[in-house]
């Protein structure tokens, strides 16, 4: 009787079971029953990365370079093109469709983990004992300045935009 | 429902060329499949002769040499068969066949 | 070619009894996706040839169950598990596996 279900890698059609055809191939023809399924590979601009019966190749991504995007890795008859983001910029998706500026960290923040082609910079408040003066993709909180290590005082204390002011001691005894 | 017919001369000449139409319903030719024809001469078995395919391509049976062409007509539905300086063994009937439907056959004799 | 031997040629069966028709390639019909392309064809008098059976073992649409193919590689078999009266006629084995196709040269089925 004809079947009602198919093996992995198959299809039914017309009560017969055929073949899929492989990644990097697409359908030309059905089975029959005197004949295999008939695939053909896709052209070099297009892909199919699954076992399929598409009749029709996608067409690879296209990185454009307006939108800031960049080839990361060409595709090939069975895997999409990657794209990524120019230097200084980050992919607004997972799919990467678009490109935006790295963010900058304002002052009193810095850089926790710095921007990749497909994520942002992170920025984190600078904790006691750290500051930012500057608003930038790249610079951690940096340390406060420590006077004494340098036989200076604390003369203005710092803040997480600022860094501590050291003076000389008072050499005035009371 | 699918059916093949054929048609042509039932009297062909020796070292003329022997020509046969089958008209296809019920299917489109260029959608699947491989159309064929098949010969019978009288008494013995069955004999391919070739194909033409859903895409126009074509296949032979060596055995009859250069003799044999099939081609088609989509715009009618129909596909054809030239068999070129027969002889009286080529006397048979012949089927055109999607192999899971044939045509009902049509008797040609070769004779002067 | 992969010529194709059935035996018996002729087989006088009484209704109600099996019976077993077998055809041997002379190469495998094994295609490289391990598909097999091998099919049973019963030609009742004065008709065309019918399929009954395709790519060993799958019976086409109408043909009664008691009809089964079975085989592998080179060695099939069609067996009818109750011959009734309309079972007579030539039976062919024909594959498709590689071309030339190539039939079988029949075996002739008769009621006792």
């Known amino acids: 009787e004809p079947p009602t279900a198919c093996r992995e890698k198959q299809y039914l059609i017309n009560s017969q079971c055929c073949s899929l055809c492989q990644p990097g191939q697409k359908l030309v023809s059905d089975c029959t029953e005197f004949t295999e399924t008939e695939c053909l590979p896709c052209s070099e601009s297009e892909f199919l990365d699954t076992w399929n019966r598409e009749t029709r190749c996608h067409q690879h991504k296209y990185c454009d370079p307006n939108l800031g995007l960049q080839v990361q890795q060409k595709g090939t008859s069975e895997t999409d093109t990657i794209c990524t983001c120019e230097e200084g910029l980050h992919c607004t998706s997972e799919s990467c469709e678009s490109c935006v500026p790295h963010r900058s960290c304002l002052p009193g923040f810095g850089v926790k983990q710095i921007a990749t082609g497909v994520s942002d910079t992170i920025c984190e408040p600078c904790p006691v004992g750290f500051f930012s003066n500057v608003s930038s993709a790249f610079e951690k909180c940096r340390p406060w300045t420590s006077c004494e290590t340098k036989d200076l005082v604390v003369q203005q204390a710092g803040t997480n935009k600022t860094d501590v002011v050291c003076g000389p001691q008072d050499r005035q005894r009371a | 429902e699918v059916q093949l017919q054929e048609s042509g001369p039932g009297l062909v000449k020796p070292s003329e060329t022997l020509s046969l139409t089958c008209t296809v319903s019920?299917?489109?030719?260029?959608?699947?499949?491989?159309w064929n024809w098949i010969r019978q001469p009288p008494g013995k078995g069955l004999e391919w002769m070739g194909y033409?395919?859903?895409?126009?391509?074509?296949n032979y049976n060596p055995s009859l040499k250069s003799r044999v062409t099939i081609s088609r007509d989509t715009s009618k539905n129909q596909f054809s068969l030239k068999l070129s300086s027969v002889t009286a063994a080529d006397t048979a009937v012949y089927y055109c066949a999607r192999l899971d439907y044939w045509g009902q056959g049509t008797t040609v004799t070769v004779s002067s | 070619d992969a010529v194709m031997t059935q035996t018996p040629l002729s087989l006088s069966v009484t209704p109600g009894q099996p019976a077993s028709i077998s055809c041997r390639s002379s190469q495998s019909l094994e295609n490289t996706n391990g598909n097999t392309f091998l099919n049973w064809f019963l030609q009742k008098p004065g008709q065309s040839p019918q399929l009954l059976i395709y790519r060993v073992s799958n019976r086409f649409s109408g043909v009664p169950d008691r009809f089964s193919g079975s085989g592998s590689g080179t060695d099939f078999t069609l067996k009818i598990s109750r011959v009734e009266a309309e079972d007579v006629g030539v039976y062919f084995c024909?594959?498709?596996?590689?071309?030339?196709?190539?039939f079988g040269q029949g075996t002739k089925l008769e009621i006792k």
């Open positions: 033409i395919r859903y895409d126009g391509s074509n």
């Open positions: 024909l594959q498709v596996t590689h071309v030339p196709f190539t």
């Open positions: 019920g299917y489109s030719i260029s959608s699947n499949y491989y």
